[in-house]
Structure formats: structure tokens, C-alpha cells
């Protein structure tokens, strides 16, 4: 799978994580920080 950094317009897309662009799937993906979940790493869990 080809990946690259997200475009600058997606700055802030991932609330608590790193945004990765999955080129072949034509989609952005959030790699969440520890303790966060959700499509955009918006949920905190204990």
C-alpha cells in the first residue's frame, strides 16, 4: 500500500493523531495517539 503525508488542507483532520494519506485507497487515515480512538482520533478512552 502506497502511503504519504496528508495534504496541508487536512491539517487538523486528526484531532489526536497523525494523518496519513492511503494513496491506493484514495483516503486519509488517522493514526491515533495512545488513549484515543475514532475515525479522527476524537474519542478518549481510559
Amino acid at each position: 500500500v502506497s502511503i504519504t503525508k496528508c495534504n496541508s488542507d487536512m491539517n487538523g483532520y486528526c484531532l489526536h493523531g497523525q494523518c496519513i494519506y492511503l494513496v491506493d485507497m484514495s483516503q486519509n487515515y488517522c493514526r491515533c495517539e495512545v488513549g484515543y480512538t475514532g475515525v479522527r482520533c476524537e474519542h478518549f478512552y481510559l
Partner: antibody, heavy 116, light 106 residues
Framework: QDQLVQSGAEVKKPGASVKVSCKAS????????IQWVRQAPGQGLEWMGR????????KYREKFEGRVTITADTSTNTAYMELSSLRSEDTAVYYC?????????WGQGTLVTVSS | DIQMTQSPSSLSASVGDRVTITCKAS??????IAWYQQKPGQAPRLLIQ???TLQPGVPSRFSGSGSGTDYTFTISSLQPEDIATYYC????????FGGGTKVEIK
């Protein structure tokens, strides 16, 4: 399956406002950005602006600043685009477009006609 | 705002010809360019994103290349069903469409 269903065609008088809705099904708009694009008859595609429904953040093309308002109601999974002070040049098909979780999934378009 | 200058605005070619359309950005868009095909009365159809990644179901005669500010879209062998208007779109910093290229058969 994922869908963006837009409101029906509108006819407005110059100086009036129009509000076009875009209802999402099959996905949560909070996971996406919703863009708005328009196309006047026989003309090219023009990006107007977008909203991040989760953060409630908007970005607008400079030429529309002050005349367009993009909003989102996450409880009904619906985005809106309101354009004020309409003029004949605003006659166009208006599209909502999902981006973020996938690349550019388009609604069916809404024709707005501005005529006296 | 980033400007996208697309050329030519129209072209006429024969079936089987190689067709090339270019888009020049006013600044580096880091390969974040897509190409759309639009036929009369229809919504635009995405053909290519991230410069050269073909969407599922799109024929391999369509291709894209480029980097920095200069990008190219190619139809290797024009077919009658390719008659349409083609648009580039930069999506690095917000969004800007090129002015479009109307492709006709000679």
C-alpha cells in the same frame, strides 16, 4: 451504501438568499469534510468552500467571503450552503462533495436559478 | 488562493490519437492533483487522484504525471466515448479547479 442527497431545484429573485441542504446517509459527516462546488450553465467548476462538521470550522473561497455561509447539523447528518445577495450570475448547479474518508464523493447537484 | 492554469481550453483530435492536457499551479502542490471527466448533463467523474493513481474501473488509456507545479493528463488512444470536458483539481491547499479542456473528435 453511502449517499449525499441534496434538496430540490430553487428559483430565486435577485437580492434574495438560497439555502441548499445536503443529507448524508451511510456515513457520519463528522468523519469527513463537506465541500461545496458550483457550475454555472456552460461554465467550469468552481470551489466555494468547505466545512469540518466535527470542529465546526469553515473555509471559503475569497470571492464568496461574506456572501456564503456553510453550516452542518451533525444530529441530522446534514450540511447546508446558504448564498445571499443573489444575482443572475449565481444561476448554477450547486454540488456538495464529501472528502476525507474517501476522495470526493459527490451529491446529485441542485439547480438554483436567479431570475426577476 | 492557488491558481490552476489549464491548457488548451479546447482541442480536436482523431480517434486513436494521443491527447495531452496540462495544468500549471501557481505554487508547489506536492502531487495533490486530481483529474475529472464531465459529460453534458452529468456530474463530474473522478479519473485520477494524487497525480497518477487511476480510480477503479477507469480505462488504462488514461494516465497522469508531474510534480511541483507542472502536471500532465494523457489519453493514450482517444476513443469516441472520451468526448467530454476534463478538469484538473488541486487539493493540497483548499481546492482550485482548472478552467477545463473540451475534447472533441475531428
Amino acid at each position: 451504501q453511502d449517499q449525499l442527497v441534496q434538496s430540490g431545484a430553487e428559483v430565486k429573485k435577485p437580492g434574495a438568499s438560497v439555502k441548499v441542504s445536503c443529507k448524508a446517509s451511510g456515513f457520519n459527516i463528522k468523519d469527513t469534510y463537506i465541500q461545496w462546488v458550483r457550475q454555472a450553465p456552460g461554465q467550469g467548476l468552481e470551489w466555494m468552500g468547505r466545512i469540518d462538521p466535527l470542529r465546526r470550522q469553515t473555509k471559503y473561497r475569497e470571492k464568496f467571503e461574506g456572501r456564503v455561509t456553510i453550516t452542518a447539523d451533525t444530529s441530522t447528518n446534514t450540511a447546508y450552503m446558504e448564498l445571499s445577495s443573489l444575482r443572475s450570475e449565481d444561476t448554477a448547479v450547486y454540488y456538495c462533495v464529501r472528502s476525507g474518508t474517501s476522495f470526493d464523493f459527490w451529491g446529485q447537484g441542485t439547480l438554483v436559478t436567479v431570475s426577476s | 488562493d492557488i491558481q490552476m492554469t489549464q491548457s488548451p481550453s479546447s482541442l480536436s483530435a482523431s480517434v486513436g490519437d494521443r491527447v495531452t492536457i496540462t495544468c500549471k499551479a501557481s505554487q508547489d502542490i506536492h502531487k495533490y492533483i486530481a483529474w475529472y471527466q464531465q459529460k453534458p448533463g452529468q456530474a463530474p467523474r473522478l479519473l485520477i487522484q494524487y497525480t497518477s493513481t487511476l480510480q477503479p474501473g477507469v480505462p488504462s488509456r488514461f494516465s497522469g504525471s508531474g510534480s511541483g507545479t507542472d502536471y500532465t493528463f494523457t489519453i493514450s488512444s482517444l476513443q469516441p466515448e472520451d468526448i467530454a470536458t476534463y478538469y484538473c483539481l488541486q487539493y493540497d491547499n483548499l481546492r482550485t479547479f482548472g478552467g477545463g479542456t473540451k475534447v472533441e473528435i475531428k
